[in-house]
Structures are given as structure tokens and as C-alpha cells.
């Protein structure tokens, strides 16, 4: 980037333009390069106390070129800015400072948000999730017979996670409570996936209860068709009661 | 130089989704700042619709937040309007603009919609 | 959101004359402001932004001005190719709005 940098070596007087090294076209031997050669860039190095004139191929970072028809010279970034494009627009801001629109600013505007990492105003992510996969088989203990009341899982997955300012995930599980299907367990018929069984539908009585995971963010919403009436309940009590023949299954 | 090229049907029905493509020449859409989409409505009013980032992120205008949707095709370089539910009240000459370093900003040719049935 | 209230709506002027457009941000938009000019049946041309910074090509003639909630573009001398209409537009907080436009007719 810095390539061909130009300073004098021998003493000489101020603006004698012999001798001066690589890109300078005039030179002195207290402020090394007066002028460069076509298409390089007069750039001030301090040295020290000193201010060492130095021609280069291209603006070092924090500096931006300007072409004038007498000279191309490099000019200083704003104070808070890393790298710049010209006077106005700033494409790297120094640490503290956030991007926005080539102004590095100490806080976003509403509506972005501040990206850490590249120190720059950001658009805000929100979740994303996908449409529910469909209800896991209908199991108790991990049963998919009996004449037990079981409980069926769905998932969904996290499309795009949420960035800092972004809105949370809603639930990504959900489980309600079913009903296993009315036969005995065949031996090793435990764990039968559901979609080799019919699953039952629940008697009239009977409303599937759906329950987000424990895990996921918004478990304590409850949904007004998903909640049981207690008449239902207490009737399904009875029903259970009233019901004495014992079932076997395998442990 | 940069180009930006809008095209998409001129007469949608209401209730309808209107459907809008942006090409862009000279210029990848995976650099620079903003690709946005702005709609001059016939009284001459701007309206800034919203955009999508060099990165794929959007920003919308909350005004249309439940209709819109901007997406992109980095291998075509383009990048597209959806705008659901129609009504009259759409009807715009629609424009895509991009906000960059160099030109700070750059607008299309603009594509009339009329919204009829 | 924030409104831009641009003034005046419409005004008239002559060739040579000097003419200033403003507009007033709801809140400061801290010089994210830019001016755009409009033919009939064209797109906005931008002529100004961070409120007083000349977009490339743009004639001189043209400056910008202001700071918070207030700001002005001025022309001077005006040219018949600058007649049309003006719009200020800022870029701070999301939406970004744009004012109402004004329109530029020869006297």
C-alpha cells in the first residue's frame, strides 16, 4: 500500500529536485518529499517533533486522496473515523463509534441497532420461525397402545435467530394430551410409530390439550380452545371410574 | 456506470399481490449500503417502502410492515417488491434506489401500478 | 415517525432569481438530510445530503444548509432547468420520510 515512498539521502539545498529518491519529484533535506511524481500521493509523516513530506501509490488508512491538477495529496479522516472514502463519508469507524451513512455517531437511530462486531448501525433482526411439523404419535411412557391418556409433541424450527434488538422466538414445541389407542400392547409393540396405528380421535368429551415445552419462551400464554372445561373433566373421571377391566403392559 | 432497472406488471386487481423485480448493472447488490424501494403515489407524495442490505437484512416502513416484503437474487443481481392485499390506494409509480458510498444515491426509471379491477 | 414539513408548497421566480426551499424535521435528524429535484416524468435527482454536502455533478448553485430540525436548500441564479419540484428526505430513524415537495414555476 505504502510503495514507493521517496525521501532524500544527500544533503542539498531546499528545493534542489536532484538526487531526491523514489516517487519525489522535489525535495529538501529537512521536510524530505516537496512534490511527488505523476498519479502518487503527498502525504505528511510525522516524525518525532517533525513533519516528513512522503509520496506514496495510495493513502495509507485514516487518510483519503484528493487529486488537484497541481497535486494529489492525502488528507486526514474526521477525528472518529478509521478509514475513509472522502471528507463526508467514513466506511470504518474508530471503536466506540457506530456507521451510519459514512457518520460514525455514538448511538443508532431508532429503528437499527448497534453491530458490535463491525461497529456499524445495522438493520434489527426478529425471529423467524418455520410452519409446525406435524404431532408426534400419540404415547404414554412411551407406549403407543393402551387405554391410557398419552401426550403428542410438534416442533418448529428457528428460521433466523433474532439480533440484539430483535423481537424473541415464540414457543418451538409444543405438547397436548391425547388419547393412545384403545387395544392391548403386543409384545414389543412399545414405542410403534404413529404412523402405523390410527390415531384416536377424542370422545365428544374429549378436547386435545396442547401444552408448550417447558423450554420455550411463551409456555405460560394459554390459548381459550386449548383450555378443558371442568364439566368435561369431572365427566371423564366418572367415565375412568366406571371402567374395571384391568389392562397388561409391558414394562 | 450503475443502473437500476424496474420492472413488474403496470395493472394488478385489488387484493391482489403486487409484484415488482429491480435489476441492477454495474454494481453488485452485495455491496454498498441500501436497496430500497420508494412510490410516488399520482398527488406526487414519496413514500419510502423499505429496503434490503448489502447483507440481506430489511427494514421496513411500519406503515406497510404486514404487506411488504423485500427479498433479493444475488446470482441474477437483482432484487424484488412484494406488496400484498392491494386496494386503489396503491396505485404509485414505483422506484427502486440504492444508497451507496461513492453516489450516496442512485434512483431507477420508475414503473407505473395501477390497482383495478 | 417523524414529519417533514417542507415550505413553501409552491412558488414562483424568474431566471436569476434566488430562491429557498425549507424543511422542518418533528425531531432532530441530526444531518441526515438530503435534497432531491424532480422533473415531470423523471426520476428525483439527489442534490444535496448530510444537509449541506453537494452531490457529485451537482451545479454550485445549489447549497444546503441547517442543522436539528431545521433545514434549507438554496439556489442561486436560478436556470430554467430548475424548475420542477424539490423534496427534502431524511435518513435517520426508520421510516425514512420524506417532506410533502415543493414546486419551483417560472414567474
Known amino acids: 500500500q505504502n510503495a514507493s515512498r521517496g525521501r532524500r539521502q544527500r544533503r542539498m539545498h531546499p528545493n534542489v529536485s536532484q538526487g531526491c529518491q523514489g516517487g519525489c519529484a522535489t525535495c529538501s533535506d529537512y521536510n524530505g518529499c516537496l512534490s511527488c511524481k505523476p498519479r502518487l500521493f503527498f502525504a505528511l509523516e510525522r516524525i518525532g517533533m517533525k513533519q516528513i513530506g512522503v509520496c506514496l501509490s495510495s493513502c495509507p488508512s485514516g487518510y483519503y486522496g484528493t487529486r488537484y491538477p497541481d497535486i494529489n495529496k492525502c488528507t486526514k479522516c474526521k477525528a472518529d473515523c478509521d478509514t475513509c472514502f472522502n471528507k463526508n463519508f467514513c466506511t470504518k469507524c474508530k471503536s466506540g463509534f457506530y456507521l451510519h451513512l459514512g457518520k460514525c455517531l455514538d448511538n443508532c437511530p431508532e429503528g437499527l441497532e448497534a453491530n458490535n462486531h463491525t461497529m456499524e448501525c445495522v438493520s434489527i433482526v426478529h425471529c423467524e420461525v418455520s410452519e409446525w411439523n406435524p404431532w408426534s404419535p400419540c404415547t404414554k411412557k412411551g407406549k403407543t397402545c393402551g387405554f391410557k391418556r398419552g401426550t403428542e409433541t410438534r416442533v418448529r424450527e428457528i428460521i433466523q435467530h433474532p439480533s440484539a434488538k430483535g423481537n424473541l422466538c415464540p414457543p418451538t414445541n409444543e405438547t397436548r394430551k391425547c388419547t393412545v389407542q384403545r387395544k392391548k400392547c403386543q409384545k414389543g409393540e412399545r414405542g410403534k410409530k404413529g404412523r402405523e396405528r390410527k390415531r384416536k380421535k377424542p370422545n365428544k368429551g374429549e378436547s386435545k390439550e396442547a401444552i408448550p415445552d417447558s423450554k420455550s419462551l411463551e409456555s405460560s400464554k394459554e390459548i381459550p380452545e386449548q383450555r378443558e372445561n371442568k364439566q368435561q373433566q369431572k365427566k371423564r373421571k366418572v367415565q375412568d371410574k366406571q371402567k374395571s377391566v384391568s389392562v397388561s403392559t409391558v414394562h | 456506470q450503475i443502473q437500476l432497472q424496474e420492472s413488474g406488471p403496470g395493472l394488478v386487481k385489488p387484493s391482489e399481490s403486487l409484484s415488482l423485480t429491480c435489476s441492477v448493472t454495474?454494481?453488485?447488490?452485495?455491496?454498498?449500503?441500501?436497496w430500497n424501494w420508494i412510490r410516488q403515489f399520482p398527488g406526487n407524495g414519496l413514500e419510502w417502502m423499505g429496503y434490503?442490505?448489502?447483507?440481506?437484512?430489511?427494514n421496513y416502513n411500519p406503515s406497510l410492515k404486514d404487506r411488504i416484503s423485500i427479498t433479493r437474487d444475488t446470482s441474477k443481481n437483482q432484487f424484488f417488491l412484494k406488496l400484498n392485499s392491494v386496494t386503489a390506494a396503491d396505485t404509485a409509480t414505483y422506484y427502486c434506489?440504492?444508497?451507496?458510498?461513492?453516489?450516496?444515491?442512485?434512483w431507477g426509471k420508475g414503473t407505473t401500478v395501477t390497482v383495478s379491477s | 415517525d417523524i414529519q417533514m414539513t417542507q415550505s413553501p408548497s409552491s412558488l414562483s421566480a424568474s431566471v436569476g432569481e434566488r430562491v429557498t426551499i425549507t424543511c422542518r424535521t418533528s425531531?432532530?435528524?441530526?444531518?441526515?438530510l438530503a435534497w432531491f429535484h424532480q422533473k415531470p416524468g423523471k426520476s428525483p435527482k439527489l442534490l444535496v445530503y448530510?444537509?449541506?454536502t453537494l452531490a457529485d455533478g451537482v451545479s454550485s448553485r445549489f447549497s444546503g444548509s441547517g442543522s436539528g430540525t431545521q433545514y434549507s436548500l438554496k439556489i442561486n441564479s436560478l436556470q430554467p432547468e430548475d424548475f420542477g419540484n424539490y423534496y427534502c428526505?431524511?435518513?435517520?430513524?426508520?421510516?425514512?420520510?420524506f417532506g410533502g415537495g415543493t414546486k419551483l414555476e417560472i414567474k
Open positions: 454495474g454494481y453488485s447488490i452485495t455491496s454498498g449500503y441500501y
Open positions: 448530510h444537509a449541506k
Open positions: 434506489s440504492v444508497l451507496l458510498i461513492q453516489y450516496f444515491n442512485i
Open positions: 425531531e432532530s435528524v441530526n444531518n441526515f
Open positions: 428526505q431524511h435518513f435517520w430513524s426508520i421510516p425514512w420520510t
Open positions: 434490503i442490505s448489502y447483507d440481506g437484512t430489511n
